[in-house]
Interface confidence: low
């Protein structure tokens, strides 16, 4: 601690602040009657250099002048930018055991003169705000540097503020604390920034501006919207603005959108009518303001107003499909299905659907409302029936969509030809077909319908379907398609009053089945063996099964087994074989094959035919 300097003094020439690259002479002098006791000649003055409180050099060899026992002068060079501490110590050479005693110290600051400040920019936020200016100070000076911001204007207006930069804080912005009012709109103002430190001073070029150049209006606030007559597409946006605002920019978008609708409004006076909104849609609105049509700056965007437009009655056509099942000789069950409207068609929350089933001669009409997307009724098998469905929200209902109820697979001449199903990737299947060969009436549309081939799927799950125009012969089905599951796919050709269909199975991805079929029984009838089995559990099929294989060989034989390959049919669970010898014991088992390969074998059963073999 060199706070007192009782033993002597330290001085610096030319000054304790020097430009980068300059040398300095540091003199250390003992006060009278100070020094090593009784032996002035043994006084040795040493100079130590510290950077960041760490001793970095003993300047013993830099002595340029020495009054033995009284004072010494050292030359220091190559000082780095910033502050360096030098401490002079007294070393009494006759007493080796005592450490050197601090005499005094000095800090030398190395820096540069300030550059002229540049890029002055001034703003006043709002009509009631104050003028604040910022600038670029240029290179770091490494010295305490004072900055003065001066403003002058009409009617002898002058104003100035000061701040400083050092190693702890940076000064490149000042708020003058004065307000420029709109009545000075045409007046010119001049600002200048002056920088001064111990090594020099510099001044910026004068920067001239007008009120309009620097005043940035406050963003609009208190934004709200009124929907005219509860309209979902027209609304009046209202807001509060500063009094001098003449131009507004409005931007608005649905919340899930990525592009804004932009509108410029002149002299809006806090109100603007919007006419192109989408009903029942979450919107975000923001507004910006400007004080002058040509000059000046836009305000920041206001805080967002987020709101949902009111509902309007649904538009669009429901996509309807149906299933027919005969119950007995004079009754049939009709199950109607439809897809939900998309939001732009629903234009609100769909509260219910109005369903009508009508015999075309108008003898019988069944009507109901439901909140579901399906409806089932039992009707007579006689007569020609038509169905219609419309969707309703709080504002009204969509136009009803009609469909004729025909026998979907009743006309062989309308059955599409060469139906194929190819897996495209993990989650879709490409279905292609050829038109019916000898249709006696024009195909109005195709319907591609699919359903997972799992137990109970007809009753548990509604079908999935796609409507295809009559000139298209392919469909890529992806809704609810999962890998390793077999789907039954039907292509329906519909005319005005008839339907024909063809069916195929398909999967989007397949593996060999996990297990083989389980043989449940082997029975002998009329010199033929009937093999009965249970199908592989649905999760273990891993795609569409193409064939079953029945293998057999004589027990204890090492020969290759014989096999019989049968086309997979879901309804079939037994098959005859007739090439086994009587009174020979055989081992039999089964496997299943998908497009990816064969399953492991199922259970083995032994059987010894008794009858006469062919």
């Amino acid at each position: 601690n060199i706070d007192v300097c009782k033993l002597g003094t330290v001085t610096v020439q030319p000054a304790p602040v020097i430009p980068l690259g300059s040398a300095a002479n540091i003199s250390c002098s003992l006060n009278p009657k100070q020094g090593c006791s009784h032996y002035p000649s043994s006084n040795e003055l040493i100079l130590l250099k510290f950077v960041n409180d760490v001793l970095v050099e003993n300047l013993h060899g830099k002595k340029v002048h020495d009054h033995t026992g009284h004072s010494s002068t050292f030359q220091v060079t190559n000082l780095s930018l910033g502050m360096t501490l030098f401490v002079c110590k007294l070393n009494c050479s006759n007493s080796q055991k005592k450490p050197p005693v601090p005499v005094c110290g000095v800090e030398i600051s190395v820096g540069v003169a300030p550059e002229p400040p540049q890029n002055i920019s001034c703003v006043q936020e709002g009509e009631n705000g104050t003028v604040a200016c910022s600038w670029n100070s240029g290179k770091v000076t490494y010295l305490k540097t004072n900055y003065t911001l001066q403003l002058s204007g009409p009617n002898n207006l002058t104003c100035q503020k000061q701040c400083f930069s050092d190693n702890r804080q940076n000064c490149n912005r000042l708020d003058l604390g004065i307000n420029l009012s709109p009545d000075l709109a045409e007046s010119r103002f001049i600002v200048r920034v002056t920088a001064i430190n111990d090594l020099g001073n510099s001044s910026s070029l004068p920067h001239t501006f007008t009120f309009l150049d620097i005043v940035i209006p406050l963003p609009p606030w208190d934004i709200r919207i009124n929907f005219l007559n509860a309209s979902g597409s027209r609304g009046t946006l209202q807001w509060e603005d500063e009094g001098q605002v003449v131009l507004n920019q409005l931007r608005y978008q649905p919340l899930n959108s990525t592009s804004w609708n932009m509108v410029n409004a002149t002299n809006a006076k806090g109100k603007y009518d919007l006419r192109d909104l989408r009903p029942f849609t979450e919107y975000e609105f923001q507004i910006s303001s400007k004080l002058h049509l040509s000059g000046g700056s836009w305000s920041n965007w206001s805080e967002s107003l987020r709101t949902r437009t009111p509902e309007e009655e649904p538009v669009g056509i429901l996509d309807i499909w149906y299933m027919k099942q005969d119950i007995d000789y004079d009754r049939q069950q009709i199950s109607l299905f439809w897809k939900s409207l998309n939001p732009s068609e629903a234009r609100g929350k769909i509260l219910h659907y109005q369903v009508t089933l009508q015999e075309v001669t108008k003898k019988t009409t069944l009507q109901n409302t439901t909140r579901h997307t399906s409806w089932t009724r039992v009707i007579p098998r006689t007569g020609a029936w038509t169905a219609s469905v419309s969707a309703a929200n709080s504002k009204g209902a969509s136009a009803p969509t009609h469909i004729n109820i025909v026998d979907l697979c009743g006309t062989g001449l309308l059955a599409p030809h060469q139906v194929s199903a190819k897996s495209e990737n993990m989650d879709n299947i490409l279905v292609t077909w050829q038109p019916p060969k000898k249709a006696d009436s024009a195909v109005r549309e195709y319907i591609v319908e699919w359903r997972a081939l799992q137990p109970g799927s007809i009753t548990k799950f509604p079908p999935h379907w796609l409507r295809i125009p009559p000139d298209n012969m392919s469909a890529l089905i992806s809704e609810n398609i999962k890998p390793y599951i077999c789907y039954e796919i039907r292509v329906h050709a519909l005319s005005e009053s008839q339907g024909g269909c063809s069916s195929i199975r398909g999967d989007s991805k397949h593996k060999a089945p996990v297990s083989g079929p389980h043989i449940t029984a082997i029975t002998e009838k009329k010199e033929r063996l009937f093999i009965s089995w249970t199908h592989i559990p649905f999760p273990e099929q891993r795609g569409c099964i193409l064939h079953y294989r029945i293998y057999w060989k004589e027990r204890d034989s090492t020969a290759q087994p014989e096999l019989c390959e049968i086309q997979y049919r879901r309804s079939q669970n037994s098959h005859p074989i007739s090439s086994l010898q009587p009174r020979v014991t055989y081992v039999l088992w089964m496997t299943a094959v998908t497009a990816a390969g064969e399953s492991p074998q199922g259970n083995e059963r032994e059987f010894c035919p008794q009858g006469k073999a062919n």
Epitope: W221, D222, R224, I225, N226, L305, T307
Partner: nanobody, 119 residues
Framework: QVQLQESGGGLVQAGGSLRLSCAPS????????MGWFRQAPGKEREVVAT????????YYADSVKGRFTISRNNAKNTAYLQMNNLRPDDTAVYYC????????????WGQGTQVTVSS
């Protein structure tokens, strides 16, 4: 439904002060934007001052700027209009109004309180 009850009106000399209060009931006050309006005899109702639900934004008619202050205390469920340096042309029935911050005009209105400034 929101009910609004104004209080604090009365007769005052020109240059005097009054403080109007408005206490909504029936729903959460802190989500309502509030406003003060006035209607002088034979004139249309005009906005005096408004305050956003958070209190962060205020608006004043030019005729009351610097004299009137709108504020709110969400903890006390009350909105205020502090009126200083009152002038005879401030004489009117003063109405408190509230609206949902989401959107819309001022949906809820009080019965009004009479402010009379004598010269």
């Amino acid at each position: 439904q929101v009910q609004l009850q104004e209080s604090g009106g009365g007769l005052v000399q020109a240059g005097g002060s009054l403080r109007l209060s408005c206490a909504p009931s029936g729903r959460t006050f802190s989500t309502l934007a509030m406003g003060w309006f006035r209607q002088a005899p034979g004139k249309e109702r005009e906005v005096v001052a408004t305050i956003s639900w958070s209190g962060g934004r205020t608006y004043y008619a030019d005729s009351v700027k610097g004299r009137f202050t709108i504020s709110r205390n969400n903890a006390k469920n009350t909105a205020y209009l502090q009126m200083n340096n009152l002038r005879p042309d401030d004489t009117a029935v003063y109405y408190c109004a509230a609206r949902e911050t989401d959107y819309g005009a001022y949906d809820y209105w009080g019965q009004g309180t009479q402010v009379t400034v004598s010269s």
